[in-house]
């Protein structure tokens, strides 16, 4: 058939067969998940830092009043 | 027609029909938006931390001068 | 020609004509830029926070020794 | 052959030949790697900030008890 002789379609098959777009989308979503997790960890650290700072401020302000 | 017999074209249809590239691009842009929002939240936390630190420094330096 | 009758090829044209993969790759790279710039801004804020903390530590340790 | 006359297939070849999806996936993974490295650097900075804060708290609480 004409397809058998077509280098263009052979190229289409060659290039895209291994990674259909579903896989690409899955990769993008996986990357999102990973980065969101990393950012979540940063967020948790920051919450901890805010707490430490609140404690420091509490100590300093209680000293000022005493 | 020749298309009916073509496993290559069937594969093209099979792989790409469900997720056209517009959807992939939309996914990428959506991921960007989400991650930017997360980073913005971190930024807001950091601004708060900077304020707390400025207050601590203010207390400490005012003590030094008194 | 056979192509004119092919719903599969019509679909290929429909799905992929507007967003060639170059555009998709460019979109991914653009997203990287934006996120890197946002992270750079966070980094600058953190550097400032580290400096403020170093100054606080300096004040506290100089007090201890006096 | 029919392919030679097909603007649709010419478009497929024109748009997609240079960037097979493997390349797109590689780009996504490369971007992930870079952003993860940047976030790792932020994480390291935060760990340092937490240590500085712990030291400040230690100094302040040791003063309170003395």
């Amino acid at each position: 058939s004409p397809q058998d002789r077509s280098p263009i379609l052979a190229e289409v098959k060659h290039s895209f067969y291994p990674i259909p777009e579903q896989t690409l989308q899955a990769t993008v979503l996986e990357v999102r998940h990973e980065l969101k997790e990393d950012i979540k960890a940063l967020n948790a650290k920051m919450t901890n830092i805010e707490k430490q700072l609140s404690e420091i401020l509490r100590i300093l302000t209680s000293r000022r009043s005493s | 027609s020749p298309q009916d017999r073509s496993p290559i074209l069937a594969e093209v249809k099979h792989s790409f029909y469900p997720i056209p590239e517009q959807t992939l691009q939309a996914t990428v842009l959506e991921v960007r938006h989400e991650l930017k929002e997360d980073i913005k939240a971190l930024n807001a936390k950091m601004t708060n931390i900077e304020k707390q630190l400025s207050e601590i420094l203010r207390i400490l330096t005012s003590r030094r001068s008194s | 020609s056979p192509q004119d009758r092919s719903p599969i090829l019509a679909e290929v044209k429909h799905s992929f004509y507007p967003i060639p993969e170059q555009t998709l790759q460019a979109t991914v790279l653009e997203v990287r830029h934006e996120l890197k710039e946002d992270i750079k801004a966070l980094n600058a804020k953190m550097t400032n926070i580290e400096k403020q903390l170093s100054e606080i530590l300096r004040i506290l340790t100089s007090r201890r020794s006096s | 052959s029919p392919q030679d006359r097909s603007p649709i297939l010419a478009e497929v070849k024109h748009s997609f030949y240079p960037i097979p999806e493997q390349t797109l996936q590689a780009t996504v993974l490369e971007v992930r790697h870079e952003l993860k490295e940047d976030i790792k650097a932020l994480n390291a900075k935060m760990t340092n900030i937490e240590k500085q804060l712990s030291e400040i708290l230690r100094i302040l609480t040791s003063r309170r008890s003395s």
Partner: antibody, heavy 114, light 107 residues
């Protein structure tokens, strides 16, 4: 077809101000970061400013504090507000799509001279 | 800032000849490099992005290669239409910086 059309260039005295505009069409403007690039009379190309799709702005040090970049997504327009202009700001100013500068407009000439 | 050193600054080549222009970055730019062609009185046009990816509508006789700090643009068989100035741009780290340009003329 992607089209970027700049306007607002002209002759201005040192210390003066000028606002450039860029009308974009042929793509979803709100999805893209946009940039300004300039070409000096010596044909040297310089990145001037970028703005992300959601409005975050970026500048090189030599224009920071003097130039502001903004966008109007509803009207598909990009702006560059330039103030405290110097003779070294004399250049052809191009509006471009993305951080990667994938498409350029035809440019608008800015001349800073007494 | 990352400095981009482009060479040669100008060159002459014959029709059909293979031409290579190089750009060296002062540090690793991880393939975040684009190549542009500018004809007299026209705005630049993108040829290559991400070091090796051919932009839409660019003939396949033009190619980009390189990684790390060293990159090159190659025209496999020079045509009269290739008379222009070529620039590289690194967009790996802001501030984004351009090479000084290479003026290519036909012998």
């Amino acid at each position: 077809e992607v089209k970027l059309v700049e306007s607002g260039g002209g002759l201005v005295k040192p210390g003066g101000s000028l606002k450039l505009s860029c009308a974009a069409s042929g793509f979803t403007f709100s999805n893209y970061a946009m940039s300004w690039v300039r070409q000096t009379p010596e044909k040297r190309l310089e990145w001037v400013a970028s703005i992300s799709s959601d409005g975050d702005t970026y500048f090189p040090d030599n224009v920071k504090g003097r130039f502001t970049i903004s966008r109007e997504n509803a009207g598909n327009i990009l702006f560059l507000q330039m103030s405290s202009l110097r003779s070294e700001d004399t250049a052809m100013y191009y509006c471009a799509r993305g951080f990667m500068i994938t498409f350029w407009g035809q440019g608008t000439l800015v001349t800073v001279s007494a | 800032d990352i400095k981009m050193t482009q060479s040669p600054s100008s060159m002459y080549a014959s029709l059909g000849e293979r031409v290579t222009i190089t750009c060296k970055a002062s540090q690793d730019i991880k393939s975040y490099l684009s190549w542009y062609q500018q004809k007299p009185w026209k705005s630049p046009k993108i040829l290559i992005y991400y070091a090796t990816s051919l932009a839409d509508g660019v003939p396949s006789r033009i190619s980009g290669s390189g990684s790390g700090q060293d990159y090159s643009l190659t025209i496999s068989s020079l045509e009269s239409d290739d008379t222009a100035t070529y620039y590289c741009l690194q967009h790996g780290e802001s501030p984004y910086t351009f090479g000084g340009g290479t003026k290519l003329e036909i012998k």
